[in-house]
């Protein structure tokens, strides 16, 4: 019996087609992805093959103005239109709190939404009962398939799930659900979830009875053969894990941003054992036409976005200096504003010992592309912010050793004075440079804001200590020459859309007046 699994993950509100790098589509003939194009390919496969499941491994929420405006209603609407068979909850599904998940998505989705390792307690337990499930058994052709969901247990540090949801260990939570399905004669089981490729592989290895793992969170690109675009494969598709009980378990993920549609064919024997598995992600490029009815619907929903872009988010009473002349040479107040917004967006009081789990921000000055003049009545709009942060990136959470951070700050000024983008703007950090010293030895003082303290204060950076830092995904991926970050990071979790972070902060503050205050000094 053959099953075709079509899968997406980490779509991050790319409802419209995008450019090859998943930013805003500029030249339509070269654009990719989007739900209208995805629908065309899905329908083509559904017509051609008998047993097809369309699955999403989480993080539909967050990433473009679509989410900022529609807050998840767009996810439910278009996933319903594409007739997804199931979705796992990702960490970003909690970005607007539990209510922001329940109302727009859980109550409106016409497909099961899954997670076996999230347990509700207190008053939330009855409110959320039945709105998401640990598993769902689906009839597919003449067989039944069990789909068991899971979500990163780090979600309380990455999003806003509140205090009434407990995120259990994935493997511990999955095993009893799989065991139950097995006793009920469900012998084909897919683990669908959002904990990253390393955990996906562990689930394949450790959870007895799981036949296939369809994952997300780490934006992993797997491919067999010559890859069709710029993404470099982390391994073959499917990635085969040998389980502790000796089975070959295929593990898949489909990069991110709706650029690819994962396509996996699995052959099962009559006892539900996987005999063979093969496939590849399908690049959703312009050779695949956009479905006209879905496209028309997208255009209808788009109207509200254009109106939103010009509405006032808040006011500034000072000039927001985002000029290259400032931000690539010295501390600039636009850099301070953005870093303060990044930290504010990551306030998560999850432990009595810590005032917050993260206090530091770094931001490449070259990523700040425009100032905002206060003389336009002080008004700040989404459109203004899109000029400052035009690349559609995310502000991510990483864990780095102090020694890596020191290298990053040395890199920040290794060729100072040439208006290059690697000069770092900061938050929760005090750095002093001596440019008279040779490159690689110019950081003379580097103090960082404590987190395990009731009164935050600046302490010298410790080389062997592990620190959490918020930074643009561009830096996490080694951009602007920050190879040491990419090579030495200990953990990387994708965060919220950059503009969304700053716009939310400005809306919250209402009036802003960021200053240059001595975060970066030269001796």
């Amino acid at each position: 019996w053959e099953l075709t699994i079509l899968h997406t993950n980490d779509v991050h509100s790319r409802l419209e087609q995008t450019s090859e790098d998943s930013s805003k589509c500029v030249n339509a003939s070269r654009c990719m992805g989007g739900v209208a194009r995805l629908f065309t390919k899905v329908q083509q496969i559904r017509r051609a093959e008998p047993n097809v499941l369309l699955l999403d491994a989480g993080d539909q929420y967050q990433g473009t103005i679509w989410f900022t405006v529609y807050k998840g209603a767009e996810v439910a609407h278009f996933m319903n239109a594409l007739r997804y068979d199931a979705m796992a909850l990702g960490n970003h599904e909690f970005d607007n709190g539990v209510e922001g998940l329940i109302e727009p998505l859980l109550k409106e989705a016409k497909f099961p939404i899954l997670s076996a390792n999230i347990k509700a307690k207190g008053p939330l337990a009855s409110q959320i009962s039945g709105l998401y499930l640990p598993y769902k058994v689906l009839p597919v052709g003449d067989e039944v398939v069990g789909i068991v969901g899971y979500t990163s247990k780090e979600t309380p540090f990455l999003s806003n799930p509140g205090t009434n949801l407990v995120f259990e260990d994935e493997i511990t939570a999955l095993q009893p659900e799989v065991d139950k399905l097995k006793t009920l004669n469900v012998n084909k089981i897919i683990a669908l979830g959002h904990s990253g490729f390393e955990m996906d592989k562990l689930i394949a290895q450790k959870v007895r009875g799981v036949d296939v793992v369809v994952g997300g969170h780490s934006n992993t690109f797997l491919y067999t053969g010559n890859p069709p675009s710029k993404e470099v494969p982390a391994g073959k598709y499917p990635f085969i894990v040998t389980s502790d009980d000796g089975r070959k378990v295929p593990v898949v993920q489909a990069y991110a941003f709706g650029k690819y549609l994962g396509y996996l064919k699995i052959e099962f024997d009559e006892r539900g054992n996987v005999i063979s598995s093969h496939g590849n992600p399908i690049l959703l490029n312009s050779s695949i036409p956009e479905d006209p009815s879905i496209k028309a619907d997208i255009n209808k929903w788009r109207i509200k976005l254009d109106n939103y872009s010009t509405q006032e988010l808040g006011k500034t009473i000072v000039y927001l200096d985002g000029s290259s002349q400032s931000c690539r040479f010295r501390e600039c107040n636009m850099g301070n504003l953005i870093c303060d917004a990044m930290i504010n967006n990551n306030l998560r009081h999850t432990d009595e010992m810590f005032w917050n789990h993260v206090s530091m921000c770094i931001l490449n000055g070259g990523g700040i592309r425009s100032p905002i003049d206060e003389r336009n009545n002080g008004t700040i709009t989404w459109e203004n912010l899109a000029a400052v942060l035009p690349f559609g990136g995310t502000f991510d959470l990483v864990q780095l050793k102090g020694s890596t951070l020191k290298k990053a700050f040395e890199h920040s000024v290794h060729r100072y004075g040439q208006s290059t983008g690697e000069f770092l703007q900061v938050g929760g950090i005090h750095v002093v440079y001596d440019l008279s010293r040779k490159p690689g030895d110019r950081v003379v003082k580097l103090d960082v804001l404590c987190t395990k303290c009731r009164v935050p204060s600046y302490d010298p950076l410790k080389m062997d200590e592990v620190y959490k830092v918020i930074l643009p995904n561009f830096l996490a991926n080694g951009g602007d020459g920050f190879q040491m970050i990419k090579d030495e990071l200990l953990r990387h979790d994708s965060g919220d859309q950059d503009i969304n972070v700053v716009s939310t902060y400005i809306s919250k503050m209402k009036v802003i007046y960021p200053a240059v205050e001595g975060r970066i000094k030269f001796s």
């Epitope: 559904r46 007739r83 497909f111 039945g130 058994v137 052709g141």
Partner: antibody, heavy 118, light 107 residues
């Protein structure tokens, strides 16, 4: 509005077969699976099976395997249930019921009474 | 197969009264539970699915609750047209299984 229209009562002889139609209207036929349910006189309900109108895929209650065949005709938006080798035990009302996105039955046909008697 | 035990098997109630019918599954059914109402000589009518979601057009006096193995259907204020037999169904796994029914009659 969503409707499932079934045929009138059937009186059939033991050992014979009967094929009951269920014509769907008011929605896209291929969007929803169709379940079939048996109700013997004065008794509770028994789930017979489920059919996917897209590909004809079927899931049967083990108890009815060999007794029942579920089929569909997409062109007429009609689901069929064939009962064969009929005995008095098969005398009952048979219902078709559409299932929603959650695979829960939502709209029911009016039922077809099958009486097996010589 | 999962067994569904409904209680009571029959009951009498007055108009305006609050009525609760329960259904217990032989194991956790993951909120995959429906409630149906059947009147004599008629086909069943679906009231609720996924334990607590009301089908369009069903009066709001009907509500469902429960999780795990235990579920209930409540009619907040009984009306004459609510008389009939009520059935629960688990659709968590195959085969789907129904409860034995609860006959609701006027006191």
């Amino acid at each position: 509005q969503v409707q499932m229209k079934q045929s009138g009562p059937e009186l059939v002889k033991p050992g014979a077969s009967v094929k009951i139609p269920c014509k769907a209207s008011g929605y896209t036929f291929t969007d929803c699976n169709m379940d079939w349910v048996k109700q013997s006189h004065g008794e509770s309900l028994e789930w017979i099976g489920d059919i996917n109108p897209n590909n004809g895929g079927t899931i049967y209650n083990q108890k009815f395997k060999g007794k029942v065949t579920l089929t569909i005709d997409k062109s007429s938006s009609t689901a069929y249930m064939e009962l064969r080798s009929l005995t008095s035990e098969d005398t009952a009302v048979y219902y078709c019921a559409r299932t929603n996105w959650d695979y829960a039955m939502d709209y029911w046909g009016q039922g077809t009474s099958v009486t097996v008697s010589s | 197969d999962i067994q569904m035990t409904q209680s009571p098997s029959s009951m009498y109630a007055s108009l305006g009264e609050r009525v609760t019918i329960t259904c217990k599954a032989s194991q956790d059914i993951n909120s995959q539970l429906s409630w149906f109402q059947q009147k004599p000589g008629k086909s069943p009518k679906t009231l609720i699915y996924r334990a607590n979601r009301l089908i369009d057009g069903v009066p709001s006096r009907f509500s469902g609750s429960g999780s795990g193995q235990d579920y209930s259907l409540t009619i907040s204020s009984l009306e004459y047209e609510d008389m009939g037999i009520y059935y629960c169904l688990q659709y968590d796994v195959f085969p789907r299984t129904f409860g034995g029914g609860t006959k609701l009659e006027l006191k």
